[in-house]
Structures are given as C-alpha cells and as structure tokens.
Interface confidence: low
C-alpha cells in the first residue's frame, strides 16, 4: 500500500539521516581536536614571542651599553696615546737640552 | 493502526534527526571558521618568531663581537697605561740624573 511504501521510504530517509549525523559528529570531533591543537600552538607561540622579545630587549640594551663602553674605551685610548705622545716629545726635548748643555 | 503509529513515530524521529543534522552542520561550520582563524594566528605568530629569532641571533653575535672589541680595547688601555708608567719613571730618573750631574 501507499502507506507502507511511504513508511519504507521514511525509514530509508531516517537511516540516511542517521548516517549523515554520525559522519557530521565525527567531522566535528576531528575539527574540534584540530582547533584545540591550533589554539594551543598559537598560545605557545605567543609565549615564545614574549620570551624572544624579552631576550631581544635585553640584548639590545646590552649592545647599547657595550657600545657606550667601546666609545669610552676608544676615548681613553685616544687620550692615553696623546699623553704618550706629549711625554715622548718632552723626553726628546729634555734629551736635546741635556746634550746641548 | 499499528502501521500508522509506527509511521508517525518514524516521521517524528526523522524530523528530530534533521534538526540534529542542522545543528551539527552549524556547529561544524563555526568550528571550521575558528580553526581557520587559529591556524592563521599560529602561522602569523610563527613568522614573528622566525623574525625575532633572526634579530636575536644577530644581536647575540653583535654582543659577542662587541665583547671581543671591549677586551681588545681594555688590553690596549692596560698596555698604554704601562707604557705611560714606564715613560714617567724614565722621565723621573732622567730628571734626577740631570739634577745630580
């Protein structure tokens, strides 16, 4: 009868719907797992960025301090070379004076 | 009849199944969107990490170079101070000799 045909079609549609539901459920679970993983990676990566930024800031400031120290030492070397030069000149002058006297 | 009752129950079950399917489909779409967003964030963050790492490596190597330069300059300062000291001593000695002669 038409009734039983409709019923049979309904049962088939219901079975198909159940299959689709299971398939979607599996897909959803897989996608949720992937999402969790991607979020964890993003969070972990953000922490790495913070860490690297801290490290970089520290090294930048260290480089600036070292640059200042280099400048200071270079000035010191220049000054000492100048003093040495003056002393040598004085020494030579005094030697000349000694020789002439 | 029993047949029509079973059919009615079947139709109700099918309607419920359809609702569940729609709900799952919506959830899946939302989760896929979130996944795409999280993956994009993770990728973008990973690029930032690479950039920061490169900068940090450069700074680390720059700091080492500067450290070597500081050491070199400090040695130079020590050497020059020593030379100055020697010259001063020589100068004093020669002054004493001059006074005594």
């Amino acid at each position: 009868t038409a009734n039983s045909v409709a019923c049979r079609d309904g049962l088939r549609a219901q079975a198909e719907c159940r299959n689709t539901t299971h398939l979607l459920q599996r897909q959803l679970t897989r996608t949720q797992d992937s999402l969790l993983q991607a979020e964890t990676q993003a969070n972990s990566c953000n922490l790495t960025v913070v860490t690297l930024q801290e490290s970089l800031e520290k090294k930048v400031s260290q480089a600036l301090e070292q640059q200042a120290r280099i400048k200071e030492l270079e000035n010191e070397v220049t000054k000492l070379n100048q003093e040495l030069e003056n002393l040598r000149i004085q020494k030579e002058t005094s030697s000349t004076v000694q020789v002439n006297s | 009849t029993a047949n029509s009752v079973a059919c009615r129950d079947g139709l109700r079950a099918q309607a419920e199944c359809r609702n569940t399917t729609h709900l799952l489909q919506r959830q899946l779409t939302r989760t896929q969107d979130s996944l795409l967003q999280a993956e994009t964030q993770a990728n973008s963050c990973n690029l930032t990490v690479v950039t920061l790492q490169e900068s940090l490596e450069k700074k680390v190597s720059q700091a080492l170079e500067q450290q070597a330069r500081i050491k070199e300059l400090e040695n130079e300062v020590t050497k020059l101070n020593q030379e100055l000291e020697n010259l001063r001593i020589q100068k004093e000695t020669s002054s004493t000799v001059q006074v005594n002669s």
Partner: antibody, heavy 115, light 108 residues
Framework: QEQLVESGGRLVTPGGSLTITCTVS????????MGWVRQAPGKGLEYIGI??????TYYASWAKGRFTISKTSSTTVDLKMTSLTTEDTATYFC??????????WGQGTLVTISS | ELDMTQTPSSTSTAVGGTVTMNCQAS??????LAWYQQKPGQPPKLLIW???DLASGVPSRFKGSGFGTQFTLTISGMQREDAATYYC??????????FGAGTNVEIK
C-alpha cells in the same frame, strides 16, 4: 645589603596548612618579581611559582590550587600551602627573580610534614 | 608547561680537566636560561644568565652557550672548589619557569 630571609618552617601534620614568609632587606619589592623554589632532602630544585611586579602570580602546574604567593607588605612575600602531604617535606627558598634569572636566594626554611 | 631535560645526571673529571653538561628545553626559550651551582647545605649560586652572560664574580672558566632549545655549560680547567651540583633554569614567557634535574660533578 640585599638579603632574603625565610621564616615559618616547622613540623606540620598531613592535611594541614602552613604559611611561610620571606622578609627582604635592602630591596625595593615593587621593582622585582619574587619566586619560591623548594628542594626535598637529597633531591633537585623544584620551581613553585612567582609573583610579578604587578602582583600577577604564575605557578608550576603541580602547585596550582594548593600554593598561593602574595606580597603581604613592602618587605614581605608569603607562600601559603594547603592540604600538605609528606611529599611537600622540603627546604623552601625565597628567590629574587629579575629578567628570568633568580639572582638572589635566601638560606631556606625547612618544612616537615609528618604524623 | 616547560620541561628541562638535563644530562648527564653525574660526571667526574680530574683537576684541570673539562666538564660539559647539557640542558634541553621542551619549548623555544630563546636565551632565557640560567645555570646555578649548589654545594651541600647551601642555596644555589647564580653562575650564568641569558644563556652565556657570566654573573658577577664568576670565574671565566665557566662558559654558557646555546639558543632556543639546546644549551651547554662548560667548565674548562676544573678546580677542586667546582665539585658541586649544577642546575639549569629555563624561563618561557613571563612566568613559566622550570629547573633541570641537576648534574652532579665530582673530582676524580
């Protein structure tokens, strides 16, 4: 001179609670993160947690929920421990931790959990 | 969560010898790594921070190196007073820190 002194360590029965204190001198607490580290007899160092300059706290995963770090005054940092077990028997060190490096340590205070 | 894997757990060398120990971080920690020396009955003493910077007053025979996840502490010209347990401490992000299990260094 800069100094950290831990106090309050004593014998406690399992399940009990205890608060130990770190008193600082010569240090401006507002400028440093302060941490707690413990060491069970004959074992290695174990990081418990840290309190930042803005009073934000971070804990090792095993310490979350049972351990609480707080700045109780301008010179003291407390470590509150609850639901203590024999596994918590250790010397507890207070540490000043700027820039990711714990650079100043107290001498430690011994906490013993036993019935 | 950050895990620090330290190797070896113990080692020995003669006076004047060289000792090397390693620390591996489970995450990329840049140069946020410190090394400590601990002798029995004493609190740990900072040797090296930011992977390679010597703490003040630390002899130059101690050398730290590494970046990212792999770090090394080398003691060149081992002295009797260097016999101790050495720990690495990694920092990840602002608050996450973890110690290695330690390396016991003895004199032969």
């Amino acid at each position: 001179q800069e100094q950290l002194v831990e106090s309050g360590g004593r014998l406690v029965t399992p399940g009990g609670s205890l608060t130990i204190t770190c008193t600082v001198s010569g240090i401006d607490l507002s400028g440093y993160a302060m941490g707690w580290v413990r060491q069970a007899p004959g074992k290695g160092l174990e990081y418990i947690g840290i309190i930042g300059t803005s009073d934000t706290t971070y804990y090792a995963s095993w310490a979350k929920g049972r351990f609480t770090i707080s700045k109780t005054s301008s010179t003291t940092v407390d470590l509150k421990m609850t639901s203590l077990t024999t596994e918590d028997t250790a010397t507890y060190f207070c540490v000043r931790s700027p820039g990711g490096s714990a650079d100043l340590w107290g001498q430690g205070t011994l906490v013993t959990i036993s019935s | 969560e950050l895990d620090m894997t330290q190797t070896p757990s113990s080692t020995s060398t003669a006076v004047g010898g060289t000792v090397t120990m390693n620390c591996q971080a489970s995450q990329n920690i840049g140069i946020n790594l410190a090394w400590y020396q601990q002798k029995p009955g004493q609190p740990p003493k900072l040797l090296i921070w930011y992977a390679s910077d010597l703490a003040s007053g630390v002899p130059s025979r101690f050398k730290g190196s590494g970046f990212g996840t792999q770090f090394t502490l080398t003691i060149s010209g081992m002295q009797r007073e260097d016999a101790a347990t050495y720990y690495c401490l990694g920092t990840y992000g602002s608050g996450v820190r973890a110690f290695g299990a330690g390396t016991n260094v003895e004199i032969k």
